[in-house]
């Protein structure tokens, strides 16, 4: 088992909104849970966009999930990752 590296980034979207993206890379096996939470509660599927789980060329895998949130509400959101029985929570950078 190889645990993922998780990286959260933000980019400007429309006025008053930002897109936050959570990327997991370098993990094995490929099964992973990656999702955005608001106040600890998973966002509905229709408000998140997921990338495919793809091989990254090193025998490990990568994927991502993104969502759009209101600027100023970043503190309420975290990316939740679960892989091979381990989990972690990742905040949106300031």
């Amino acid at each position: 088992t190889v645990p993922p590296m998780v990286n959260v980034t933000r980019s400007e979207a429309s006025e008053g909104n930002i897109t936050v993206t959570c990327r997991a890379s370098g993990f094995y096996p490929w099964n992973i849970t990656l999702s955005w939470r608001q106040d600890g509660v998973s966002l509905s599927h229709d408000t998140q966009q997921w990338g495919d789980v793809l091989p990254d060329g090193n025998g490990t895998y990568q994927t991502w999930v993104a969502t759009r949130i209101c600027q100023g509400e970043e503190q309420r959101f975290t990316c939740y990752m679960e892989h091979s029985g381990n989990h972690s929570t990742h905040p949106v950078p300031s």
Epitope: R37, Q38, D39, G40, V41, S42, L43, S44, T47, Q75, R76, T78, Y80, E82, H87, S88, T89, H90, P91
Partner: antibody, heavy 118, light 108 residues
Amino acid sequence: EIQLVQSGAEVKKPGASVKVSCKPSGYAFTSNNIYWVRQAPGQGLEWIGYIDPYIGRIIYNQQFKDRATLTVDKSTSTAYLELSSLRSEDTAVYYCSRSGERSNFDYWGQGTLVTVSS
Amino acid sequence: EIVLTQSPATLSLSPGERATLSCSASSSISSNYLHWYQQKPGQAPRLLIYRTSNLASGIPARFSGSGSGTDFTLTISSLEPEDFAVYYCQQGGSLPLTFGQGTKVEIK
């Protein structure tokens, strides 16, 4: 089975502080937020705040920001609510709850009655 | 702050009757963020319905939820003796998280 077990009832004098504990079991402690809610006698439910045990992030209801302190002890998988400068209006049952996959409060502790009286 | 107003405050009904409880929000709420809880005397609340219309685990099918925007409804199709309790709506869309003041369903 998921359970949240809270500490016992407390009687405090006005101006004192109280610390209530909440020990969840049946799931990974750091995977879900712990919320705190209170209910005055015969009244409704009032959200105090929550803490993310994994990263330690705390969000307070502004109404409680100056007097409530939320903490966790990851070594014992226990969450705490401390409320300072108690007054009679703080007499209430204090509940801890766990954030769920789809809602804010999916499992609840049994409640801790805090009575503030001179 | 989003204020949730529940009506009626008290509902007096007999077992077997249909109960309709309303929850009105002061601002529009996404249906993903409106939840219902049941509380019996001396007990903690328990999750009944999440995201407006989804039954929580172990909740019987006589309970249902609906609504959108600012108006939401909890319906109990045929009251059982164990359904007499206080019901709260709660919104998780904006901070602070808020609850309605509750509707007490009592035996007539």
